[in-house]
């Protein structure tokens, strides 16, 4: 979309913002929209919060289409109510040593984050806090009964999906990489980003990747056969093109994606990889994009919750879609 | 009630100027986009200019782009057209008009002031 | 985009049904696909009106006698049964590219 032709706004009055969300300009100057924030993603027509000192970022020169919103080089960080500095570590729990990097926080888990499945001699099992310990373990005790009205729909866990070895050191750099975040949306197309060194010069950069949890159509519920109370991998009865502002992906794919439960537990990516996906626009233009695939998923009660100041933030918009 | 006011129309020598003015009322002015349109004498409607909510896009007849500005005063509930160089083919009754930005363009007019532009 | 009218005058009784073509020189789909074809009407010694938008909706205070269809790049306007305050000029417009243009107007007069 140019910025050519007349304004022409939707029928609707301008919209209601979430408080902090600021009212701005399109970016053609035409329509009055909610501005786009951190880590979502932007276009001509979605500009990003400008009172945030955000820009969309978009990438290589050639998708100047579809971006991410991203801070200013430099932009410090604001986490757990504490100003971090651009390329300051800290560590936000005993769990977490995360890395502020131009207003964004990425964070590696210093517990194991490993899925544990159900299994014959361990059929729910859930991981507790020990009295004294930084880190929570499995344990294999029955479940409380759990009043839950609908699907538990998380839209991640930290999952078993590592970059490079934390450890590894390579020409006089210590090579990081963070976990990448949560999807920003429990259907649909999101993005989830994380901080990385592992570049020919040891410097620190943000990368991001588009992700689909599960798609919005899908009733999955519908699907839970009789007597269970979960569907972690539901089948995908045809190959999909995925869509994107517009643009739609060049090839169909048989994506796998995540299912939901009954019972209060939470289907959230157990493995997943990254590939590019070519998307192609009505006015001919392609773009490529990197992409979430998941491989697995694991259903399970480690949901997530407010009792870690990290997890609660890095969840929290997991649910009602707000990104 | 709502009321759009055009004035600072009137008789003007060829190369000269006018500041046209509208005065809008009854309705909340930042809401909206505002336009100018013009009638020739005996001829049809013209689309001469308009301007977004805030003043930060104007869009006007690639034609008079060079000499005429529309822009807005939301403190004033005002909007104003700028005309510059006038020439004879420019005398036309200057019709105000709001412009929803949505569904219709040009939902209320004024009255129109007359610009002559004569030696 | 040049809008052309026909015809340019149209007598009728009042009572009559008149209808009023309207034809652009390319198609006035909106890059948002949306058409902005519009009627307004002017009365003699009035600022015009407007009557219809997108093509086929009724301004708010409109009689229902006023009906607006087309596609593409031809649109009608029809008055079902004409009544004296109907007179005057209708100017179709399309607001889908720039620049903004009207028609030439069709004169509405009593035979």
């Known amino acids: 979309q140019n910025c050519s032709g007349p304004c022409r706004c939707p029928d609707e009055p301008a919209p209601r913002c979430p408080a902090g969300v600021s009212l701005v300009l399109d970016g053609c100057g035409c329509c009055r929209v909610c501005a786009k924030q951190l880590g979502e993603l932007c276009t001509e027509r979605d500009p990003c919060d400008p009172h945030k000192g955000l820009f969309c970022d978009f990438g290589s020169p050639a998708n100047r289409k579809i971006g991410v919103c991203t801070a200013k080089d430099g932009a410090p960080c604001i986490f757990g109510g504490t100003v971090y500095r651009s390329g300051e570590s800290f560590q936000s729990s005993c769990k977490y040593q995360c890395t502020c990097l131009d207003g964004a926080v990425g964070c590696m888990p210093l517990c194991s984050m490993d899925v544990r499945l159900p299994s014959p001699d361990c059929p729910f099992p859930r991981r507790v806090k020990l009295p004294g310990k930084c880190c929570e373990e499995w344990v294999c005790d029955e479940p409380k009964d759990q009043t839950v009205v609908g699907p538990a729909l998380a839209a991640y866990r930290l999952e078993d999906t590592f970059g490079p070895d934390p450890t590894m050191i390579r020409a006089n750099c210590l090579v990081q990489t963070t976990e990448w975040s949560a999807c920003s949306k429990t259907c649909g197309m999101g993005i989830s980003t994380r901080v990385t060194n592992d570049n020919a010069s040891c410097r620190l950069e943000k990368q991001s990747r588009l992700c689909m949890v599960r798609p919005c159509e899908a009733d999955l519920e519908e699907n839970i056969k009789k007597g269970k109370k979960c569907i972690r991998t539901p089948k995908i009865s045809k190959p999909i093109k995925f869509e994107l502002s517009g643009c739609t992906s060049m090839k169909t794919y048989r994506a796998k994606f995540c299912g939901v439960c009954t019972d209060g537990r939470c289907c959230t990516p157990h493995r997943t990889t990254t590939l590019p996906v070519e998307f192609k626009c009505p006015d001919g233009e392609v773009m490529k994009k990197n992409m979430m695939f998941i491989k697995t998923c694991a259903c399970h009660y480690n949901c997530p919750g407010d009792n870690d100041i990290f997890e609660s933030l890095y969840y929290r918009k997991m649910y009602g879609d707000m990104a | 009630e709502v009321q759009l006011v055009e004035s600072g129309g009137g008789l003007v020598q060829p190369g000269g100027s006018l500041r046209l003015s509208c005065a809008a009322s009854?309705?909340?002015?930042?809401?909206?986009?505002m336009a100018w349109v013009r009638q020739a004498p005996g001829k049809g409607l013209e689309w001469v200019a308009n301007?977004?909510?805030?003043?930060?896009?104007?869009d006007l007849l690639a034609s008079l782009k060079s000499r005429f500005t529309i822009s807005r005063d939301n403190a004033k509930n005002s909007v104003y057209l700028q005309m510059n160089s006038l020439r004879a083919e420019d005398t036309a009754v200057y019709y105000c008009?709001?412009?929803?930005?949505?569904?219709?363009?040009?939902?209320?007019w004024g009255a129109g002031t007359t610009v002559t532009v004569s030696s | 985009v040049v809008m052309t009218q026909t015809p340019l005058s149209l007598p009728v009784s009042l009572g009559d049904q008149a209808s009023i073509s309207c034809r652009s020189s390319?198609?006035?789909?909106?890059?948002?696909?949306?058409?902005?074809l519009e009627w307004y009407l002017q009365k003699p010694g009035q600022s015009p009106q407007l009557l219809i938008y997108?093509?086929?909706n009724r301004d708010s205070g409109v009689p229902d006698r006023f009906s607006g269809s087309g596609s593409g790049t031809d649109f009608t306007l029809k008055i079902s049964r004409v009544e004296a305050e109907d007179l005057g000029v209708y100017y179709c417009?399309?607001?889908?590219?720039?620049?903004?243009?009207f028609g030439q107007g069709t004169k509405l007069e009593i035979k």
């Open positions: 008009a709001r412009d929803t930005s949505r569904g219709s363009y040009f939902d209320v």
């Open positions: 390319q198609s006035i789909v909106h890059y948002n696909g949306n058409t902005y």
């Open positions: 301007i977004n909510y805030e003043g930060s896009r104007t």
């Open positions: 009854g309705f909340t002015f930042s809401d909206y986009y």
């Open positions: 417009f399309q607001g889908s590219h720039f620049p903004l243009t």
């Open positions: 997108k093509v086929s």
